[in-house]
Amino acid sequence: MCDAFVGTWKLVSSENFDDYMKEVGVGFATRKVAGMAKPNMIISVNGDLVTIRSESTFKNTEISFKLGVEFDEITADDRKVKSIITLDGGALVQVQKWDGKSTTIKRKRDGDKLVVECVMKGVTSTRVYERA
């Protein structure tokens, strides 16, 4: 069910990411380094366990989860959050919650691309990945 996402993906474009990070509350120094990073995203599936690994000069992170089951995550920008990821209309929809706040990260296939939409309040960032 997540097979369309499996593989290694490289970031090819990023729109409004700094404004999104500002809205999340990420500090200037972290925004600067995170904004310069060009991460590779490696997605794998083993039974009902999905793993998403991000690798960049900024930070390497990895989450392993089962759909619909909440888990603890330390984000690349160093937030400690509670996350839950579900499959909705073919998209992987992640909700992160921390300090009474929440943000939604939607990963979806669009042709041969993987599009990641990050939403915090009224601010949306779109980041596009292609197969590496």
């Epitope: 500090g27 120094a29 972290t30 900024f58 160093d78």
Partner: antibody, heavy 119, light 108 residues
């Protein structure tokens, strides 16, 4: 445990340069930026700049751009700040501190190096 | 540059007294990026409160922080002798990183 070790004192002559060191231990050096802060006697804290050891990327306070050069040696987990064309105005305590991401605050500080510029 | 104005610059409090130090910010910042440090003479600053309201490791629970936008404060519910120190606020929501000038808190 996280530690940032700095030499206690440096004495240099006006017009000379000095390279201050900050040796990190107890964590993965490349995971956190290192910031440098100046404090003149009886005064407040002044941000000089920061460096991300993983990428070597620096962010400098404009006021110190021609004064301070920040570098790292990842093999020894050490951050350096070179101060050039020293004058008495540069006499101060210089702290290095580790940046905690997201919030961008300094969660661990070195003991500080007292720099005295005098002939 | 975002200017942080601390008040008062100097104050004295008796043991058991409630103390409030304020940090006024010249333009609105994210509450995640406003922090407080404690410094005692001849020692390096210590992280005290981060992200407006989170106590750093080892900080007594009599300390608290609050605020949003352009107005922030550090409060001690009941002053103790060991709280005598200088407190600095700091922001890094916007470049460049800036500190307040400090509030020196003395024991009366």
């Amino acid at each position: 445990q996280v530690q940032l070790q700095q030499p206690g004192a440096e004495l240099v002559k006006p017009g000379a340069s000095v390279k201050l060191s900050c040796k990190a231990s107890g964590y993965t050096f490349t995971s956190n930026a290192i910031t440098w802060v100046k404090q003149r006697p009886g005064q407040g804290l002044e941000w000089i700049g920061d460096i991300s050891p993983g990428s070597g990327s620096t962010t400098n306070n404009e006021k110190f751009k021609s004064k301070a050069t920040l570098t790292v040696d990842t093999s020894s987990s050490t951050a350096y700040m070179q101060l050039s064309s020293l004058t008495s105005e540069d006499s101060a305590v210089y702290y290095c501190a580790r940046l905690r991401g997201f919030y961008d605050y300094f969660d661990f500080w070195g003991q500080g190096t007292t720099l005295t510029v005098s002939s | 540059e975002v200017v942080l104005t601390q008040s008062p610059a100097l104050m004295a409090a008796s043991p058991g007294e409630k103390v409030t130090i304020t940090c006024s910010v010249s333009s609105s910042i994210s509450s995640s990026n406003l922090h407080w440090y404690q410094q005692k003479s001849e020692t390096s600053p210590k992280p005290w409160i981060y992200g407006t309201s989170n106590l750093a490791s080892g900080v007594p629970v009599r300390f608290s922080g609050s605020g949003s936008g352009t107005s922030y404060s550090l409060t001690i519910s009941s002053m103790e002798a060991e709280d005598a120190a200088t407190y600095y606020c700091q922001q890094w929501s916007h470049y460049p990183l800036t500190f307040g000038a400090g509030t020196k808190l003395e024991l009366k």
